[in-house]
């Protein structure tokens, strides 16, 4: 069965910036996908972008890079402008198109732990600092000890007494012992900074594999449209976009004048052609 | 929940007539056309007519002069006219709303179940 897996990040360096994954995992063509947020495509949903294995991306504010990853993946680079953050409580919506076979679409949104309020990388410093001191508070008691036995055998040294050589070859044993564990606790300084991640997400999280990352499939849905094709042609679409209620093609942000429903589309706004001769429509 | 729902399709003889019907409804997307495309047995997929956000229809040669598109603003459906009807026309019928890339095409992300047509005599 068909599968959408959808991976919401924020960028460790930028708390403002966030980053869509999703992927497809099943056989057949894509012929289109669409990411949304606030909900699932034709539910409630806001697209951000679409994409067309052929003809290129579209996006709409605030998505700032839309892009094919492998053949059934992509990701999508959003700029938030807010201070508040909105991206951190919201659902991302991920719809993968196979037509005339169907569509799968499934939602994630981002973990809890890389919320910025409750994020973990400035926790660590104090409780670092705290073994810090205890650890430079101990080498300090091993240092004052071996200082002070040393003053002790060198006391002990200028007296003519005939057991003194022995005692100075214990010195340098006891002395090498004194050390040993100031050692380990430097080694033990050196291992909270080597073993304490920081970074949200792996650095190479987008050269990995789709089946490594966090599939979230909440609201995973499958639409069966159509019957199965033998042929599909992939297929999707640029340029402006109608925002449709309840059925109607209408302007943004303006209601139809009309109490009836209906199809009113709205002026083009879309971009530079993609492909210059492609077989479609005319 | 977005719903295509095709109708009109049939046995008819060549140089027949048929209109197709589709009936949308629980559309809330960002969308930039609607129009037909069809699928022949044993082929592939070939967008026939759509209407783009400028109003304007747009047709593939093979069918321009033949069909007709257009749109009922009070019954929120959109149709299709096909008068001339050739064998080459028999093909599942598909209703589509979609994205534009380019000025003509139209790119399906959300479609119906189809409807049959055959022109045969």
């Known amino acids: 069965t068909p599968e959408v897996w959808v991976q919401v990040q924020m960028e460790a360096t930028e708390l403002s910036s966030f980053t869509v994954h999703c992927g497809f995992l099943g056989p057949g063509s894509i012929s289109l996908v669409t990411v949304s947020w606030g909900g699932p495509d034709g539910a409630g949903g806001t697209k951000l972008a679409v994409l067309h294995p052929e003809l290129g991306t579209r996006q709409w504010a605030p998505a700032r890079q839309a892009r094919w990853e492998t053949q059934s993946s992509i990701s999508l680079a959003l700029e938030d402008s807010g201070a508040s953050s909105p991206f951190a409580n919201t659902t991302f919506c991920c719809k993968f198109a196979s037509f005339p076979e169907g569509s799968w679409e499934s939602c994630g949104s981002l973990p809890p732990s890389s919320d910025p309020g409750l994020s973990a990388p400035p926790t660590p410093v104090p409780i670092l600092r705290a073994d810090l001191a205890g650890i430079l508070g101990l080498s300090g008691v091993l240092l004052f000890g071996c200082g002070y036995l040393l003053h002790l055998l060198r006391r002990q040294k200028h007296r003519p007494t005939p057991r003194l050589q022995p005692s100075h070859t214990n010195s340098q044993a006891l002395t090498a012992q004194a050390w040993a564990p100031s050692q380990a606790s430097q080694a033990a300084l050196h291992d909270p900074y080597a073993t304490i991640n920081t970074s949200f997400c792996p650095a190479t999280l987008d050269t990995a594999h789709p089946n490594g990352w966090a599939s979230l499939p909440t609201h995973a849905a499958h639409q069966p449209q159509g019957p199965a094709a033998s042929a599909s042609t992939p297929i999707l679409a640029r340029g402006s976009f109608v925002s449709v209620e309840n059925g109607l093609y209408t302007q943004a942000g303006e209601r139809p004048p009309h109490t009836g429903p209906g199809l009113t589309l709205f002026p083009d706004c879309r971009g530079p052609r993609a492909v210059e001769g492609r077989f479609g429509v005319r | 929940e977005v719903q295509l729902v095709e109708s009109g399709g049939g046995l008819v003889q060549p140089g027949g007539s048929l209109r197709l019907s589709c009936a949308a409804s629980?559309?809330?997307?960002?969308?930039?056309?609607m129009g037909w495309f069809r699928q022949a047995p044993g082929k592939g997929l070939e967008g026939v007519a759509h209407?783009?956000?400028?109003?304007?229809?747009r047709y593939v040669d093979s069918v321009k002069g033949r069909f007709t598109i257009s749109q009922d603003h009070a019954k929120n459906s959109l149709y299709l006219q096909m008068n001339s009807l050739r064998a080459e026309d028999t093909a599942v019928y598909y209703c589509?709303?979609?994205?534009?890339?380019?000025?003509?095409?139209?790119?399906?992300?959300?479609w119906g179940q189809g409807t049959m047509v055959t022109v045969s005599s």
């Open positions: 209407i783009d956000s400028d109003g304007i229809p």
């Open positions: 589509v709303v979609g994205f534009k890339f380019d000025e003509d095409y139209c790119a399906p992300n959300d």
């Open positions: 629980g559309y809330t997307s960002r969308t930039d056309c």
